[in-house]
């Protein structure tokens, strides 16, 4: 039974040349993290493998960056940068948790954090 | 250039144990790559059979995951394989190549050019 | 774990031709797939990785699309040295799966 919950940095806004974290965590299940992918809705942006570290897809290279912990860097925003993003936890023996923030890059200087919110 | 050779019996026995190792010279071992094993039975596909990483972590197909051992020496610049209890489904080339995980995930950028182990008795 | 369909098993063709190789996966490996090349006795070759990048060395007429379940791997003007099996595999999750191959031959 899948008892984990994720929990995201939600709705999030950056300004146009900007850098945003997008970041998700974890809780309330004793599930070992095997790996966790950082998508956008059809391309791949980033692999964490509990074995082999970081991979950063050759698309992204130049402007992702790995980290804090599971999380990841998006830099030199683009307004095309807007959109979802999900994190994909994959855990044993739970299976998969999926996180999304949607992330809105604005082209002005009025761009702020959204509140946190959970997907169960 | 980086290349991997790998070495072992042609021939064992059912119920017997595999052992065959890879070889990996012009390149420095120690440094931040994995190292796995494929294997192609005759005329068919090809199959993942684990890895071991740069911290030792490995990783097995579920498959073969109770016959199946991945290790590594780093003083003599190999990594071997060991699948215990064979029949012949286990007849094929054997494979070994490296991991660059940072640059290409988990596809395969460099390989030994292939062993074949036959099991018979 | 996830299966890779090749389609189709085997092709014929002729050189100069445009070739294309669909690969299918059961479930989503977003962008995490990778194409090999291999000729008799002899072992792999990787040609692409992250679905469309060309690996170092390998010829410009190969190229690679598709996200998600559905990929393809193009040739663009088949010379005598592309006739070879080629195979998908998906490096989303581990297992690692490879597809069965399609067999490229001479027409």
């Known amino acids: 039974m899948m008892t984990g919950t994720i929990e995201t940095t939600g709705n999030i806004s950056a300004e146009k040349g900007g850098s945003i974290i997008l970041q998700c965590h974890l809780s309330s299940t004793t599930a070992q993290v095997t790996q966790v992918n950082w998508e956008q809705q059809d391309q791949l942006l980033a692999i964490c493998n509990a074995d082999l570290g970081w991979h950063i897809s050759p698309s992204f290279k130049d402007r992702v960056a790995p980290g804090p912990g599971l999380g990841l860097t998006l830099q030199s925003l683009t307004v095309n940068d807007t959109g979802e993003y999900f994190c994909i936890y994959h855990t044993y023996p739970d299976g998969t948790y999926t996180g999304r923030i949607f992330l809105e890059v604005l082209e002005s200087s009025v761009a702020e954090h959204g509140a946190r919110f959970q997907i169960p | 250039d980086v290349q991997l050779q790998e070495s072992g019996p042609g021939l064992v026995k059912p119920s017997q144990t595999l052992s065959l190792t890879c070889t990996v010279s012009g390149h420095s071992f120690t440094s931040d790559y994995a190292w796995s094993w494929i294997r192609q039975p005759p005329g068919k596909g090809l199959e993942w059979i684990g890895y071991?990483?740069?911290?030792?972590?490995?990783n097995y197909n579920p498959s073969l995951k109770s016959r199946v051992t991945i290790s590594r020496d780093t003083s003599k610049n190999q990594f071997s394989l060991k699948l215990s209890s064979v029949t012949a489904a286990d007849t094929a080339v054997y494979y070994c190549a490296r991991l660059d995980y940072g640059n290409y995930g988990g596809a395969m950028d460099y390989w030994g050019q292939g062993t074949s182990v036959t099991v018979s008795s | 774990d996830i299966q890779m369909t090749q389609s189709p098993s085997s092709l014929s063709a002729s050189v100069g031709d445009r070739v294309t190789i669909t690969c299918r996966a059961s479930?989503?490996?977003?962008?995490?797939l990778a194409w090999y090349q291999q000729k008799p006795g002899k072992a792999p070759k990787l040609l692409i990785y992250s679905a469309s990048s060309l690996q170092s060395g390998v010829p410009s007429r190969f190229s690679g699309s598709g996200s998600g379940t559905d990929f393809t791997l193009t040739i663009s003007s088949l010379q005598p040295e592309d006739f070879a099996t080629y195979y998908c595999?998906?490096?989303?999750?581990?297992?690692?799966?490879f597809g069965g191959g399609t067999k490229l031959e001479i027409k």
């Open positions: 071991i990483s740069y911290s030792d972590s490995t």
């Open positions: 595999q998906q490096h989303y999750i581990t297992p690692w799966t």
């Open positions: 479930q989503h490996v977003s962008t995490a």
